[in-house]
Protein backbone atom coordinates (compact mmCIF):
# COMPACT_ATOMS: atom_id res chain seq x y z
CA UNK A 1 0.00 0.00 0.00
CA UNK A 2 1.02 3.59 -1.22
CA UNK A 3 0.61 6.53 1.08
CA UNK A 4 -1.80 9.07 -0.68
CA UNK A 5 0.20 11.51 -3.35
CA UNK A 6 -2.07 14.26 -3.71
CA UNK A 7 -5.08 16.01 -3.05
CA UNK A 8 -8.43 14.55 -3.55
CA UNK A 9 -10.73 15.27 -7.18
CA UNK A 10 -12.61 18.05 -6.28
CA UNK A 11 -9.37 19.55 -3.78
CA UNK A 12 -6.59 22.07 -5.00
CA UNK A 13 -3.14 22.28 -2.74
CA UNK A 14 -2.59 25.91 -1.22
CA UNK A 15 -0.76 26.90 1.76
CA UNK A 16 -0.32 23.33 3.15
CA UNK A 17 -3.96 22.81 2.63
CA UNK A 18 -6.04 20.66 0.40
CA UNK A 19 -9.24 23.06 -0.37
CA UNK A 20 -12.14 22.34 -1.73
CA UNK A 21 -12.99 23.65 -5.10
CA UNK A 22 -16.10 25.79 -5.79
CA UNK A 23 -18.94 24.18 -7.22
CA UNK A 24 -20.07 24.85 -11.13
CA UNK A 25 -22.03 28.28 -10.77
CA UNK A 26 -19.64 29.40 -8.28
CA UNK A 27 -16.50 31.62 -7.94
CA UNK A 28 -13.50 31.53 -5.63
CA UNK A 29 -14.17 34.45 -3.01
CA UNK A 30 -11.23 33.11 -0.75
CA UNK A 31 -9.20 29.82 0.07
CA UNK A 32 -9.51 28.15 3.02
CA UNK A 33 -6.95 27.82 5.91
CA UNK A 34 -6.38 25.62 8.66
CA UNK A 35 -9.24 27.08 10.32
CA UNK A 36 -11.77 28.15 7.52
CA UNK A 37 -13.56 26.75 4.83
CA UNK A 38 -12.97 27.67 1.05
CA UNK A 39 -15.33 30.67 0.55
CA UNK A 40 -17.47 31.06 -2.71
CA UNK A 41 -19.95 32.53 -4.24
CA UNK A 42 -22.76 31.93 -6.52
CA UNK A 43 -22.07 33.91 -10.41
CA UNK A 44 -24.08 37.24 -11.37
CA UNK A 45 -26.62 37.19 -13.56
CA UNK A 46 -25.62 36.76 -17.00
CA UNK A 47 -22.31 34.94 -16.04
CA UNK A 48 -21.36 31.55 -15.21
CA UNK A 49 -18.98 28.43 -14.60
CA UNK A 50 -19.60 25.31 -15.74
CA UNK A 51 -16.85 23.47 -13.78
CA UNK A 52 -15.48 22.95 -10.08
CA UNK A 53 -13.20 25.75 -10.23
CA UNK A 54 -11.35 28.34 -8.26
CA UNK A 55 -11.55 31.15 -10.42
CA UNK A 56 -11.97 34.45 -8.76
CA UNK A 57 -14.14 35.15 -11.81
CA UNK A 58 -17.40 34.04 -13.61
CA UNK A 59 -17.36 33.98 -17.54
CA UNK A 60 -20.02 35.90 -19.65
CA UNK A 61 -22.62 34.87 -21.06
CA UNK A 62 -22.17 34.68 -24.86
CA UNK A 63 -24.30 37.04 -26.95
CA UNK A 64 -26.46 35.88 -29.80
CA UNK A 65 -26.20 38.87 -32.09
CA UNK A 66 -28.57 39.15 -33.95
CA UNK A 67 -26.85 41.70 -36.39
CA UNK A 68 -24.78 38.29 -37.24
CA UNK A 69 -27.67 36.79 -37.75
CA UNK A 70 -27.82 34.85 -34.32
CA UNK A 71 -30.45 33.89 -32.37
CA UNK A 72 -30.63 32.25 -28.62
CA UNK A 73 -31.45 28.24 -28.75
CA UNK A 74 -30.70 28.03 -25.23
CA UNK A 75 -30.30 30.60 -22.16
CA UNK A 76 -27.39 30.19 -19.80
CA UNK A 77 -27.42 29.20 -16.52
CA UNK A 78 -24.88 30.37 -13.44
CA UNK A 79 -23.48 26.52 -15.14
CA UNK A 80 -23.82 26.65 -18.74
CA UNK A 81 -23.06 29.18 -21.25
CA UNK A 82 -25.55 30.69 -23.65
CA UNK A 83 -26.23 28.56 -27.24
CA UNK A 84 -26.56 30.68 -30.35
CA UNK A 85 -27.75 29.27 -33.73
CA UNK A 86 -28.93 30.50 -36.42
CA UNK A 87 -32.23 32.58 -38.04
CA UNK A 88 -33.79 30.36 -40.37
CA UNK A 89 -31.95 29.83 -43.94
CA UNK A 90 -29.06 30.43 -42.57
CA UNK A 91 -25.92 28.14 -40.38
CA UNK A 92 -23.00 29.13 -37.95
CA UNK A 93 -19.52 29.41 -39.74
CA UNK A 94 -17.71 27.32 -36.92
CA UNK A 95 -18.77 25.20 -33.86
CA UNK A 96 -18.65 28.06 -31.75
CA UNK A 97 -21.65 29.82 -33.59
CA UNK A 98 -20.02 33.11 -33.84
CA UNK A 99 -21.65 33.78 -37.12
CA UNK A 100 -23.96 32.75 -39.52
CA UNK A 101 -24.05 32.65 -43.15
CA UNK A 102 -26.69 32.08 -45.75
CA UNK A 103 -27.12 28.34 -46.54
CA UNK A 104 -25.79 27.20 -50.34
CA UNK A 105 -28.28 26.29 -52.73
CA UNK A 106 -27.63 23.58 -55.08
CA UNK A 107 -27.15 24.57 -58.74
CA UNK A 108 -28.78 22.92 -61.64
CA UNK A 109 -27.05 19.38 -62.14
CA UNK A 110 -26.91 18.97 -58.51
CA UNK A 111 -29.41 17.85 -55.91
CA UNK A 112 -29.79 18.59 -52.10
CA UNK A 113 -28.59 15.70 -50.39
CA UNK A 114 -28.56 17.06 -46.90
CA UNK A 115 -31.00 19.80 -46.08
CA UNK A 116 -28.80 22.25 -43.84
CA UNK A 117 -29.24 22.74 -40.24
CA UNK A 118 -28.67 25.70 -38.11
CA UNK A 119 -25.24 24.39 -37.56
CA UNK A 120 -24.46 22.65 -41.00
CA UNK A 121 -24.92 24.19 -44.63
CA UNK A 122 -26.58 22.19 -47.01
CA UNK A 123 -24.71 19.02 -48.69
CA UNK A 124 -25.03 18.55 -52.35
CA UNK A 125 -24.80 15.67 -54.78
CA UNK A 126 -24.56 15.57 -58.33
CA UNK A 127 -27.63 13.87 -60.12
CA UNK A 128 -26.94 10.63 -60.99
CA UNK A 129 -27.59 9.29 -64.76
CA UNK A 130 -31.83 9.27 -64.41
CA UNK A 131 -31.93 12.16 -62.55
CA UNK A 132 -31.88 15.98 -63.16
CA UNK A 133 -32.39 19.49 -61.24
CA UNK A 134 -33.20 22.16 -63.45
CA UNK A 135 -33.16 24.95 -60.66
CA UNK A 136 -30.92 26.30 -58.18
CA UNK A 137 -32.16 25.39 -54.47
CA UNK A 138 -31.71 24.73 -50.93
CA UNK A 139 -34.45 21.76 -50.87
CA UNK A 140 -34.60 20.31 -53.77
CA UNK A 141 -33.69 16.55 -54.65
CA UNK A 142 -32.72 15.46 -57.98
CA UNK A 143 -35.57 14.49 -59.62
CA UNK A 144 -35.65 11.31 -61.91
CA UNK A 145 -36.56 11.68 -65.70
CA UNK A 146 -39.80 11.31 -67.03
CA UNK A 147 -40.54 7.51 -67.94
CA UNK A 148 -42.30 7.97 -71.33
CA UNK A 149 -43.33 4.54 -71.35
CA UNK A 150 -45.31 4.49 -68.86
CA UNK A 151 -47.50 7.33 -70.73
CA UNK A 152 -47.13 5.71 -73.84
CA UNK A 153 -45.23 8.28 -75.42
CA UNK A 154 -41.45 7.77 -76.53
CA UNK A 155 -38.00 9.60 -75.73
CA UNK A 156 -38.08 12.25 -77.95
CA UNK A 157 -35.04 14.08 -76.18
CA UNK A 158 -32.74 12.60 -74.01
CA UNK A 159 -32.65 13.47 -70.42
CA UNK A 160 -29.25 15.66 -68.89
CA UNK A 161 -28.11 15.61 -65.36
CA UNK A 162 -30.12 19.49 -66.02
CA UNK A 163 -32.74 18.72 -68.00
CA UNK A 164 -35.58 16.47 -68.24
CA UNK A 165 -36.43 14.00 -70.91
CA UNK A 166 -39.17 15.01 -73.29
CA UNK A 167 -41.35 13.22 -74.73
CA UNK A 168 -43.66 12.68 -77.84
CA UNK A 169 -46.65 10.77 -79.50
CA UNK A 170 -45.20 7.47 -81.07
CA UNK A 171 -44.47 7.70 -84.97
CA UNK A 172 -47.73 5.75 -86.27
CA UNK A 173 -45.84 5.14 -89.97
CA UNK A 174 -43.64 2.84 -88.09
CA UNK A 175 -46.29 -0.03 -87.34
CA UNK B 1 -18.87 26.97 11.22
CA UNK B 2 -18.45 23.08 9.94
CA UNK B 3 -20.77 21.10 11.15
CA UNK B 4 -21.83 17.18 11.05
CA UNK B 5 -24.78 16.29 13.10
CA UNK B 6 -25.85 12.65 12.95
CA UNK B 7 -29.15 10.91 13.73
CA UNK B 8 -31.00 9.83 17.15
CA UNK B 9 -29.78 6.89 19.02
CA UNK B 10 -31.33 3.57 17.60
CA UNK B 11 -32.14 0.02 19.37
CA UNK B 12 -32.56 -2.91 16.84
CA UNK B 13 -32.64 -6.63 17.09
CA UNK B 14 -30.75 -9.25 15.62
CA UNK B 15 -30.70 -9.51 11.98
CA UNK B 16 -32.03 -6.15 11.31
CA UNK B 17 -30.81 -3.29 9.47
CA UNK B 18 -30.03 0.29 10.72
CA UNK B 19 -29.60 3.27 8.66
CA UNK B 20 -27.85 6.43 10.34
CA UNK B 21 -27.81 10.00 8.94
CA UNK B 22 -24.76 12.78 9.07
CA UNK B 23 -25.85 16.27 7.82
CA UNK B 24 -22.77 18.39 6.96
CA UNK B 25 -23.09 22.27 7.04
CA UNK B 26 -20.15 24.87 6.61
CA UNK B 27 -18.63 23.60 3.80
CA UNK B 28 -18.93 22.52 0.31
CA UNK B 29 -20.73 18.27 1.46
CA UNK B 30 -19.17 17.12 -2.60
CA UNK B 31 -15.43 18.34 -1.86
CA UNK B 32 -14.22 16.28 0.82
CA UNK B 33 -14.68 12.64 0.99
CA UNK B 34 -16.42 11.03 4.52
CA UNK B 35 -15.57 8.62 6.57
CA UNK B 36 -17.81 6.53 8.34
CA UNK B 37 -16.21 4.66 11.91
CA UNK B 38 -17.29 2.89 15.04
CA UNK B 39 -16.58 2.30 18.57
CA UNK B 40 -17.41 -0.72 20.75
CA UNK B 41 -18.04 0.03 24.36
CA UNK B 42 -14.84 0.19 26.18
CA UNK B 43 -12.88 -0.39 22.61
CA UNK B 44 -10.90 1.34 20.05
CA UNK B 45 -12.16 3.28 16.66
CA UNK B 46 -12.89 0.97 13.95
CA UNK B 47 -12.95 2.52 10.19
CA UNK B 48 -15.87 1.31 8.25
CA UNK B 49 -15.31 2.78 4.81
CA UNK B 50 -15.88 6.22 2.77
CA UNK B 51 -17.78 7.54 0.47
CA UNK B 52 -17.48 10.15 -2.36
CA UNK B 53 -20.26 12.57 -1.83
CA UNK B 54 -19.49 13.79 -5.00
CA UNK B 55 -20.07 10.64 -7.50
CA UNK B 56 -21.25 8.78 -5.04
CA UNK B 57 -17.98 6.41 -4.94
CA UNK B 58 -17.40 4.36 -1.88
CA UNK B 59 -14.96 2.21 -0.37
CA UNK B 60 -15.90 -0.54 2.43
CA UNK B 61 -13.42 -2.18 4.61
CA UNK B 62 -13.50 -5.93 4.10
CA UNK B 63 -14.64 -6.95 7.37
CA UNK B 64 -17.94 -4.58 6.31
CA UNK B 65 -18.07 -5.90 2.85
CA UNK B 66 -21.80 -7.23 1.85
CA UNK B 67 -23.61 -5.75 5.09
CA UNK B 68 -22.57 -2.24 4.57
CA UNK B 69 -24.08 0.65 2.54
CA UNK B 70 -22.69 4.04 2.11
CA UNK B 71 -25.09 6.42 0.51
CA UNK B 72 -25.34 10.61 0.28
CA UNK B 73 -28.18 12.91 -1.12
CA UNK B 74 -26.00 16.21 -2.14
CA UNK B 75 -29.41 18.28 -2.14
CA UNK B 76 -29.24 17.97 1.47
CA UNK B 77 -26.13 17.68 2.57
CA UNK B 78 -26.60 14.33 4.08
CA UNK B 79 -24.27 10.92 4.11
CA UNK B 80 -25.97 7.68 5.34
CA UNK B 81 -24.40 4.27 6.48
CA UNK B 82 -26.67 1.28 6.73
CA UNK B 83 -25.68 -1.56 8.47
CA UNK B 84 -27.82 -5.25 7.50
CA UNK B 85 -27.43 -8.14 9.24
CA UNK B 86 -26.85 -6.60 13.07
CA UNK B 87 -25.45 -8.59 15.68
CA UNK B 88 -25.13 -8.17 18.77
CA UNK B 89 -21.76 -7.00 18.45
CA UNK B 90 -22.38 -4.23 16.35
CA UNK B 91 -23.34 -2.70 19.58
CA UNK B 92 -21.44 0.41 19.05
CA UNK B 93 -21.41 4.53 18.61
CA UNK B 94 -21.52 5.55 14.99
CA UNK B 95 -19.51 8.23 13.91
CA UNK B 96 -18.83 9.80 10.31
CA UNK B 97 -16.30 12.16 9.88
CA UNK B 98 -15.07 14.68 7.42
CA UNK B 99 -11.76 13.38 5.80
CA UNK B 100 -9.14 16.67 5.36
CA UNK B 101 -6.55 15.86 3.43
CA UNK B 102 -3.01 18.19 4.20
CA UNK B 103 0.54 18.62 2.63
CA UNK B 104 3.44 18.76 4.98
CA UNK B 105 7.21 18.54 4.78
CA UNK B 106 6.76 16.95 1.27
CA UNK B 107 4.25 14.19 1.58
CA UNK B 108 0.28 14.36 2.29
CA UNK B 109 -1.43 12.43 4.52
CA UNK B 110 -5.06 12.50 5.21
CA UNK B 111 -6.90 13.12 8.71
CA UNK B 112 -10.24 13.39 10.27
CA UNK B 113 -10.47 16.82 10.81
CA UNK B 114 -14.58 17.26 12.02
CA UNK B 115 -16.17 14.49 13.59
CA UNK B 116 -20.37 14.21 14.49
CA UNK B 117 -21.81 13.91 17.79
CA UNK B 118 -21.91 9.83 17.61
CA UNK B 119 -24.55 7.62 17.05
CA UNK B 120 -25.70 4.92 19.58
CA UNK B 121 -26.91 1.93 17.90
CA UNK B 122 -27.95 -1.12 20.34
CA UNK B 123 -28.55 -3.98 18.67
CA UNK B 124 -30.30 -6.59 21.70
CA UNK B 125 -33.18 -9.12 21.42
CA UNK C 1 -4.33 -3.69 7.09
CA UNK C 2 -1.84 -1.77 9.38
CA UNK C 3 -1.90 -3.11 12.79
CA UNK C 4 -1.24 -0.42 15.10
CA UNK C 5 -0.12 -0.82 19.18
CA UNK C 6 -0.50 1.71 22.38
CA UNK C 7 1.09 1.66 25.44
CA UNK C 8 0.04 1.91 28.06
CA UNK C 9 -3.74 1.08 27.60
CA UNK C 10 -4.16 3.07 30.68
CA UNK C 11 -2.55 4.95 33.09
CA UNK C 12 -3.15 6.98 36.42
CA UNK C 13 -1.30 10.67 36.37
CA UNK C 14 -1.76 13.80 38.75
CA UNK C 15 -2.15 17.40 37.50
CA UNK C 16 1.11 18.61 36.80
CA UNK C 17 2.84 15.47 35.48
CA UNK C 18 4.18 14.55 32.65
CA UNK C 19 2.89 12.02 30.39
CA UNK C 20 4.30 10.00 27.40
CA UNK C 21 2.28 7.55 25.42
CA UNK C 22 3.63 5.41 23.02
CA UNK C 23 2.70 4.17 19.60
CA UNK C 24 3.74 1.31 17.36
CA UNK C 25 3.37 0.81 13.87
CA UNK C 26 3.50 -3.08 12.39
CA UNK C 27 5.47 -1.33 9.38
CA UNK C 28 7.03 1.75 8.17
CA UNK C 29 4.60 4.50 8.02
CA UNK C 30 7.30 7.35 7.95
CA UNK C 31 5.64 10.00 9.64
CA UNK C 32 1.79 9.16 8.48
CA UNK C 33 0.37 9.45 12.31
CA UNK C 34 -1.94 11.67 13.64
CA UNK C 35 -3.01 11.70 17.35
CA UNK C 36 -6.88 12.23 19.12
CA UNK C 37 -7.94 13.02 21.80
CA UNK C 38 -11.37 12.04 23.35
CA UNK C 39 -13.22 13.42 25.69
CA UNK C 40 -16.20 10.92 27.94
CA UNK C 41 -19.01 10.69 25.60
CA UNK C 42 -17.70 12.85 22.91
CA UNK C 43 -16.61 12.59 19.40
CA UNK C 44 -12.42 12.44 18.82
CA UNK C 45 -10.71 15.80 18.16
CA UNK C 46 -7.31 15.79 16.04
CA UNK C 47 -4.49 16.82 18.95
CA UNK C 48 -1.46 16.31 16.56
CA UNK C 49 -0.61 15.38 12.80
CA UNK C 50 1.70 14.12 11.34
CA UNK C 51 3.71 12.87 13.82
CA UNK C 52 4.66 16.04 15.14
CA UNK C 53 3.10 18.65 13.50
CA UNK C 54 0.88 20.49 16.40
CA UNK C 55 -2.67 21.99 14.96
CA UNK C 56 -3.08 25.60 15.99
CA UNK C 57 -5.28 26.01 19.05
CA UNK C 58 -4.01 22.67 20.59
CA UNK C 59 -1.86 23.54 23.48
CA UNK C 60 1.74 23.83 23.49
CA UNK C 61 2.12 21.04 26.60
CA UNK C 62 0.88 18.79 23.80
CA UNK C 63 3.96 17.35 21.56
CA UNK C 64 4.76 14.86 19.67
CA UNK C 65 7.48 12.85 17.77
CA UNK C 66 9.28 10.09 15.85
CA UNK C 67 8.60 8.13 12.33
CA UNK C 68 8.77 4.83 10.75
CA UNK C 69 7.21 2.38 13.25
CA UNK C 70 7.94 4.03 17.24
CA UNK C 71 6.07 7.38 17.96
CA UNK C 72 5.09 8.92 20.96
CA UNK C 73 2.99 11.63 22.85
CA UNK C 74 4.05 13.63 25.36
CA UNK C 75 1.83 16.38 27.64
CA UNK C 76 4.90 18.41 30.15
CA UNK C 77 2.22 19.28 32.41
CA UNK C 78 -0.91 17.32 33.12
CA UNK C 79 -4.29 19.92 33.14
CA UNK C 80 -7.68 18.96 34.50
CA UNK C 81 -8.86 18.46 30.45
CA UNK C 82 -6.42 16.41 29.26
CA UNK C 83 -8.05 13.72 30.93
CA UNK C 84 -9.47 11.14 28.47
CA UNK C 85 -8.13 8.50 25.83
CA UNK C 86 -5.70 9.26 23.22
CA UNK C 87 -5.95 7.35 19.99
CA UNK C 88 -3.02 6.87 17.19
CA UNK C 89 -3.95 6.30 13.60
CA UNK C 90 -1.88 5.72 10.54
CA UNK C 91 -2.82 8.11 7.64
CA UNK C 92 0.03 5.71 5.16
CA UNK C 93 -2.64 3.32 3.14
CA UNK C 94 -6.01 2.42 3.49
CA UNK C 95 -7.56 1.80 5.51
CA UNK C 96 -6.50 3.87 8.46
CA UNK C 97 -6.18 1.61 11.69
CA UNK C 98 -5.79 2.98 14.99
CA UNK C 99 -4.24 2.13 18.39
CA UNK C 100 -6.10 0.33 20.98
CA UNK C 101 -6.01 3.60 23.13
CA UNK C 102 -4.65 4.81 25.76
CA UNK C 103 -6.80 6.26 29.03
CA UNK C 104 -5.39 9.17 31.30
CA UNK C 105 -7.35 8.91 34.81
CA UNK C 106 -6.99 11.20 37.37
CA UNK C 107 -4.40 9.01 40.20
Known amino acids: PEPPTACREKQYLINSQCCSLCQPGQKLVSDCTEFTETECLPCGESEFLDTWNRETHCHQHKYCDPNLGLRVQQKGTSETDTICTCEEGWHCTSEACESCVLHRSCSPGFGVKQIATGVSDTICEPCPVGFFSNVSSAFEKCHPWTSCETKDLVVQQAGTNKTDVVCGPQDRLRA | QVQLVQSGAEVKKPGASVKVSCKASGYTFPGYYMYWLRQAPGQGLEWMGW????????NYAQKFQGRVTMTRDTSISTAFMELSRLRSDDTAVYYC??????????????????WGQGTTVTVSS | DIQMTQSPSSLSASVGDRVTITCRAGQNISRHLNWYQQNPGKAPKVLIHPASSLPSGVPSRFSGSGSGTDFSLTISSLQPEDFGTYFCQQSYSTPPTFGGGTKVELK
Open chain 2, 97 to 114: AREKPRYFDSFYYYLMDV
Open chain 2, 51 to 58: INPDSGDT
